[in-house]
Interface confidence: low
């Protein structure tokens, strides 16, 4: 008899990452009979939604439906029609929406309401849109990278999946940088997590993990830049701000009203004798670094050790995966190689920031000027945050791995979020038969809601 190809017994899931600067849709796929195994879920598609983050639609909520259309239609094409109805769709909004909610709960709810109504119109199994906490964002990012690196697998391998993978079961820490917040998450070495807000306990695949996590709201790269500008304009003697974080010859006019729009600049707000000011780049890495350091209050620490702003941080431990904007920025600057030391990165940043704006524009003609102009700041900010903020040193820098994808799946919180909400990370080691719902554990922490 002729061999007939059996239909693939696969499942799909969709997660929308509604970030502060943009929204991305991720489609995940996995073999149905292996959904409790570690490392079987993989990303098959990423669709970047054209336009800004959803928080920017606060005055034009009627445009949200159109905004989401292209990527949702793309999901319809990628996922076989027969599976549409059983494919879960989750939308998680992060720090951009956390900031909007701080300004007005009503406005944030209005945006989410329209998002939910738009997503409900598609033939998928829509599971809701919500603003995830910073703690969840950190935790799910940590789960994602360790799941993809095979750290939860009990089978030790004699080969490595990825170049920087150490062939042991020590988990990687997760460093996530967004536009509005940044997260640091790792398992400290025999260290008490002195602040309960920063402690998570997981039981995954039969093993207990005590995890430290913190999300610094307003310390994503875009909000950090707004903070820096608001701080520096306080001491400008007129409406010219000579800024070392922009290339020499770069000029841009900023509205003071835009500067003070975000809650992140409230602490620096003051009545200025002008409505607009002009940034004039002077391109000096060291001065830029010095200015950024002033955003980190290290003058008080109620714990044995702090990152900044009085937030507990245990001693760093093990290897770290740095993803999202940590990766995008360093990739653009060509600084993601494992061989590049921290000293070399600093030297390269000094040279890059000192390059005249006209030269930069010519060298990177294909890059949007808005993004291009901010790489000097962003690169310097990343160094400042990692070295002074999180206390990495020239030596421990070598334990930071700038990661875009692992095994074809983007590093980020979305995969971990879906794994949790679809109950695909069992608390105990999977048996040959799937376990009942009751044996699954999201995490023993009041901030986390397990979805059924």
């Amino acid at each position: 008899t002729q061999n007939k190809a059996l239909p693939e017994n696969v499942k799909y899931g969709i997660v929308l990452d509604a970030g502060s600067s943009h929204t991305s849709l991720y489609i995940y796929k996995w073999p149905a009979e292996k959904e409790n195994d570690t490392g079987v879920v993989h990303q098959v598609e990423e669709c970047r939604v054209k336009g800004p983050g959803i928080s920017k639609f606060v005055q034009k909520v009627n445009e949200i439906g159109i905004y989401l259309t292209d990527c949702m239609e793309r999901a319809r094409e990628v996922i076989p029609r027969s599976q549409h109805q059983e494919t879960p769709v989750y939308l998680g909004a992060t720090a951009g929406m956390r900031l909007l909610r701080m300004e007005s709960e009503e406005l944030a709810d209005r945006v989410l309401d329209v998002v939910e109504r738009s997503l409900s119109n598609y033939p998928f199994d829509f599971q809701g849109a919500r603003i995830i906490t910073g703690q969840e964002e950190g935790a799910y990012g940590w789960i994602t990278i360790n799941y993809l690196l095979g750290k939860f697998s009990q089978k030790t391998r004699w080969f490595s999946i990825v170049p920087y993978e150490t062939n042991n079961q020590e988990t990687f820490g997760a460093l996530d940088l967004g536009g509005a917040s940044t997260q640091v998450t790792f398992v400290p070495q025999n260290q008490t997590i002195e602040s309960p807000d920063n402690a998570l306990q997981f039981r995954l695949y039969g093993k207990d993990y005590n995890v430290y996590t913190h999300s610094f709201l307003c310390y994503g790269k875009d909000q950090a830049l707004w903070q820096k500008l608001a701080k520096d304009i306080q001491v400008a003697s007129n409406e010219i701000l000579r800024d070392p974080c922009f290339h020499p010859g770069y000029k841009k006019v900023v509205n003071v009203s835009d500067l003070y729009k975000t809650p992140c600049t409230k602490r620096f707000e003051m009545t200025l004798p002008f409505q607009q000011f002009e940034i004039q780049g002077i391109g000096n890495y060291q001065q830029c670094h010095q200015s950024i350091l002033e955003l980190f209050n290290t003058s008080y620490c109620p714990y044995s050790q702090c990152a900044f702003n009085g937030i507990f941080l245990p001693p760093l431990q093990g290897d770290f995966g740095a993803f999202s904007a940590f990766y995008f920025v360093m990739k653009f600057l060509n600084l993601t190689s494992e061989k590049v030391s921290q000293e070399k990165v600093t030297e390269m940043m000094k040279k890059f920031c000192a390059q005249p704006w006209e030269e930069i524009k010519t060298s990177y003609a294909g890059v949007k000027e808005k993004y291009l102009s901010e790489y000097c700041f962003s690169g310097t900010y990343i160094l400042s945050l990692l070295l002074q903020g999180y206390h990495f040193t020239a030596d421990s820098w070598e334990h930071i791995h700038f990661i875009g994808k692992i095994q074809g799946s983007d590093a980020g919180w979305t995969l971990g979020y879906m794994l949790n909400l679809t109950n695909m990370i069992p608390a105990e080691q999977p048996l040959s038969t799937p376990l009942s719902h009751s044996t699954y554990v999201a995490h023993h922490h009041h901030h986390h809601h397990h979805h059924h």
Partner: antibody, heavy 119, light 107 residues
Framework: EVQLVESGGGLVKPGGSLKLPCAAS????????MHWVRQAPEKGLEWVAY????????YYADTVKGRFTISRDNAKNTLFLQMTSLRSEDTAMYYC????????????WGQGTTLTVAS | DIQMTQSPSSLSASLGERVSLTCRAS??????LIWLQQKPDGTIKRLIY???TLDSGVPKRFSGNRSGSDYSLTISSLESEDFADYYC?????????FGGGTKLEIK
Amino acid sequence: EVQLVESGGGLVKPGGSLKLPCAASGFTFSDYGMHWVRQAPEKGLEWVAYISSGSSIIYYADTVKGRFTISRDNAKNTLFLQMTSLRSEDTAMYYCARDLYYDHVLDYWGQGTTLTVAS
Amino acid sequence: DIQMTQSPSSLSASLGERVSLTCRASQEISGYLIWLQQKPDGTIKRLIYAASTLDSGVPKRFSGNRSGSDYSLTISSLESEDFADYYCLQYASYPRTFGGGTKLEIK
């Protein structure tokens, strides 16, 4: 002409309190961060505290943390150092200095005022 | 905290002589260093900022230099008004820290 004038020094008993003012003139005081620095007799300079232009950032040396408070009144162009629980080791000449990144870091200093803590 | 180790603690030199004072930082300070002069009457004056930039009004015989974590102040030809105490200060991080000082005396 930039001028910084400290005053208010004197003799104080251990455990006592004193507030030192520093009057600024000749520049836009509200644009600048300000420092207090001290020098014990026959010793080197020791940084004490810093306050940013808008008072949003404040730092202290460990030796004075919890006892000294730096503050400013931008309307009156005056910097202050409130000192409490004074000890004999706080005996020193106290200087104020202005600070504005990038080229005005501690570029002008006052002439100093003397504090003596003794019973 | 960043320690600044200044040497020598005292130095006797003659008019017209060239002298160098050094400060070593215990951690990277990326050139965030100033040099100060304190006259016998207690007056303090900044000479150099950002490790090597001369303040306006400061004679050209003063110069600042950096070599790794070592920072130096050189006076190319001593004049009588240069005999004073000299301090370095790092402004890379808080707390700000001074070198122990160098007393420059006439030989």
